[in-house]
């Protein structure tokens, strides 16, 4: 994996100090040749929290596009999920216009639907380099 | 440590136009959110607008949408609000104010001294 | 907008008596994010605001144990256990869930 990237299970992990909007986030991982994190497996779940600390942080799953979706084309309905109880929600009570398109995780670790402009950490992940 | 200094206030007409600054230093301006938060004599606190990290969002209590600009210079550490249009009803005390984290907070942890905006005929 | 109601909206202490301050808001202020954007200000006479609480019970660094806040979903609670002269001031609760922010009317804490 490149420095400051954290290796598990055969895939390169990179978590942000800072915030930015999901959009934002999505961009910052491709030009890294990686994507935001997809969440395949309890296990998998669990190392993205021992690392991430216990603040909002975005991951590669929207539903801007109408049905939830992983950012790899990962199949949503079959895959791994981890919401907060009556999560997502799509809640438009929060003001800042439409409704809740994006997924992060919180505090905890489960996952909840948020405004995808709010500036949350994030993680990106890539596929390990095989010659390394 | 985090210092905010406003600076721009004064006594202008009704109708007419005044541009406040804010002035950080002691940290990654361009990492933070920041809001304006007003106080009328005697009176409580009103937020009035805030501001994303880069620029990209800019949200505004009704009372003064279409009248006031949130902007920044990232470059030059630097918050401003352009108002125009003002009202005897906008003469306050304007605050900086700098989210608490350079991530989504939804709070304020740091606000400067305030600069007096008295619109008077 | 969402309405915070304070009350009291004055209240006068005998330094070393506890103080408790109550904020009801018109909406539930917990997030699906599992947090609950609740805060506290003290505005000290001649100051700008300073942030006391954070999410109804964090006390902000620097920020004496005699202040503690509690409360849920509507309901929120702020008390000093034990007063002192320099606690003089408005105290604000606020909310953040939804844009506008709003804050509750103040209530003025002086020292008997």
């Known amino acids: 994996c490149p420095v400051n990237w954290l290796e598990y299970e055969g895939s390169c992990y990179w978590f942000s100090r800072s915030g930015k909007s999901w959009p934002e986030a999505d961009k910052y991982c491709q030009l890294e040749s990686a994507h935001l994190v997809v969440v395949n497996s309890r296990e998998e779940q669990k190392f993205i929290q021992h690392h991430m600390g216990p603040v909002n942080t975005w991951m590669g799953l929207t539903d801007q596009s109408g049905p939830w979706k992983w950012v790899d084309g990962t199949d949503y309905e079959t895959g791994f999920k981890n919401w907060r109880p009556e999560q997502p929600d799509d809640w438009y009570g929060h003001g800042l216009g439409g409704g809740e398109d994006c997924a992060h995780f919180t505090d905890d670790g489960r996952w909840n639907d948020d405004v995808c402009q709010r500036p949350y950490r994030w993680v990106c992940e890539a596929a390990r380099d095989p010659a390394t | 440590q985090v210092q905010l200094v406003e600076s721009g206030g004064g006594v202008v007409q009704p109708g007419r136009s005044l541009r406040l600054s804010c002035a950080a230093s002691?940290?990654?301006?361009?990492?933070?959110?920041m809001h304006w938060v007003r106080q009328a004599p005697g009176k409580g606190l009103e937020w009035v607008a805030i501001i994303w990290y880069d620029g990209s969002y800019k949200y505004y209590a009704d009372s003064v949408k279409g009248r006031f600009t949130i902007s920044r210079d990232n470059s030059k550490n630097t918050l401003y609000l352009q108002m125009s249009s003002l009202r005897a009803e906008d003469t306050a005390v304007y605050y900086c104010?700098?989210?608490?984290?350079?991530?989504?907070?939804?709070?304020?942890?740091?606000w400067g001294q305030g600069a007096l905006v008295t619109v008077s005929s | 907008d969402i309405v915070m109601t304070q009350t009291p909206l004055s209240l006068s202490v005998t330094p070393g008596q506890p103080a408790s301050i109550s904020c009801k808001s018109s909406?539930?202020?917990?997030?699906?994010?599992?947090?609950?954007?609740l805060y506290w200000y003290l505005q000290k006479p001649g100051q700008p605001p300073q942030l006391l609480i954070y999410e109804v019970s964090n006390r902000f660094s620097g920020v004496p144990d005699r202040f503690s806040g509690s409360g849920s979903g509507t309901d929120f609670t702020l008390k000093i256990s034990r007063v002192e002269a320099e606690d003089v001031g408005i105290y604000y609760c606020?909310?953040?869930?939804?844009?506008?922010?709003?804050f509750g009317q103040g209530t003025r804490v002086e020292i008997k």
């Open positions: 606020m909310q953040s869930i939804q844009i506008p922010w709003t």
């Open positions: 002691g940290f990654t301006f361009s990492s933070y959110g």
């Open positions: 104010a700098r989210d608490a984290h350079d991530f989504w907070s939804g709070y304020f942890a740091y």
């Open positions: 909406q539930s202020l917990l997030h699906g994010d599992g947090k609950t954007y």
